[in-house]
């Protein structure tokens, strides 16, 4: 079989509040009931895990309580939101999708979404 295809937008600009959202869509070769989604950040060949969630098809994604990610799923599409981003977090955010159950296991890795984060200018002091 070919690698499971995972599509995600090439570029996203974070909001002034440090929030970025993007869709991760995968072409499921089978009827998966349990899916694991991991967001990885790649910068200068270093890769770190940002967040991960396992969900049952038709149910909500549940990230850990202290996760900077939230998300929803609809069919073979996952809507991901990352918050608390700062300029130093600019990088390539890669969506990794694993079809965990039922067998066989499938793995697909997206080509990444370049998220640009611009820290807001501090408000000037007011004399009023």
């Amino acid at each position: 079989c070919k690698a499971m295809h995972v599509a995600q937008p090439a570029v996203v600009l974070a909001s002034s509040r440090g929030i970025a959202s993007f869709v991760c869509e995968y072409a499921s070769p089978g009827k998966a009931t349990e899916v694991r989604v991991t967001v990885l950040r790649q910068a200068d060949s270093q890769v770190t895990e940002v967040c991960a969630a396992t969900y049952m098809m038709g149910n909500e994604l549940t990230f850990l309580d202290d996760s900077i990610c939230t998300g929803t799923s609809s069919g073979n599409q996952v809507n991901l939101t990352i918050q608390g981003l700062r300029a130093m977090d600019t990088g390539l955010y890669i969506c990794k999708v694993e079809l965990m159950y039922p067998p066989p296991y499938y793995l697909g890795i997206g080509n990444g979404t370049q998220i640009y984060v611009i820290d807001p200018e501090p408000c000037p002091d007011s004399d009023f």
């Epitope: 060949s45 895990e49 390539l92 890669i94 296991y105 793995l107 890795i109």
Partner: nanobody, 126 residues
Framework: EVQLVESGGGLVQPGGSLRLSCAAS????????IGWFRQDPGKEREMVSC????????KYADSVKGRFTISRDNSKNTVYLQMNSLRAEDTAVYYC???????????????????WGQGTRVTVSS
Amino acid sequence: EVQLVESGGGLVQPGGSLRLSCAASGFSSDYYDIGWFRQDPGKEREMVSCIRSSGGSTKYADSVKGRFTISRDNSKNTVYLQMNSLRAEDTAVYYCGLAPISPVHAVCNQHYFGYWGQGTRVTVSS
């Protein structure tokens, strides 16, 4: 379905050599990373060596540099790990892993692996 089948493990004396083989099947992409990892009971799986299918970029753990050599035979979809000057600390279960990556992905990064073989045991002891 992706299948990775390892062979070549066994018992060897310190200073000896072994050659591990990993035969990959069920995967038709011509771009991937494939490599060798090892794991001791109760420890994390660590990358030993890895090679990119296209271009042949390689990566080695510091602890095996100069002693282990990874190579591939694309016509047989097989990757080999030649292990020389084996030490007691090389004792572990060795797993073959595959990462279905593309050119944008960092070479041989453990986060991108997900397909695994069943493992072959290597024991270095006198």
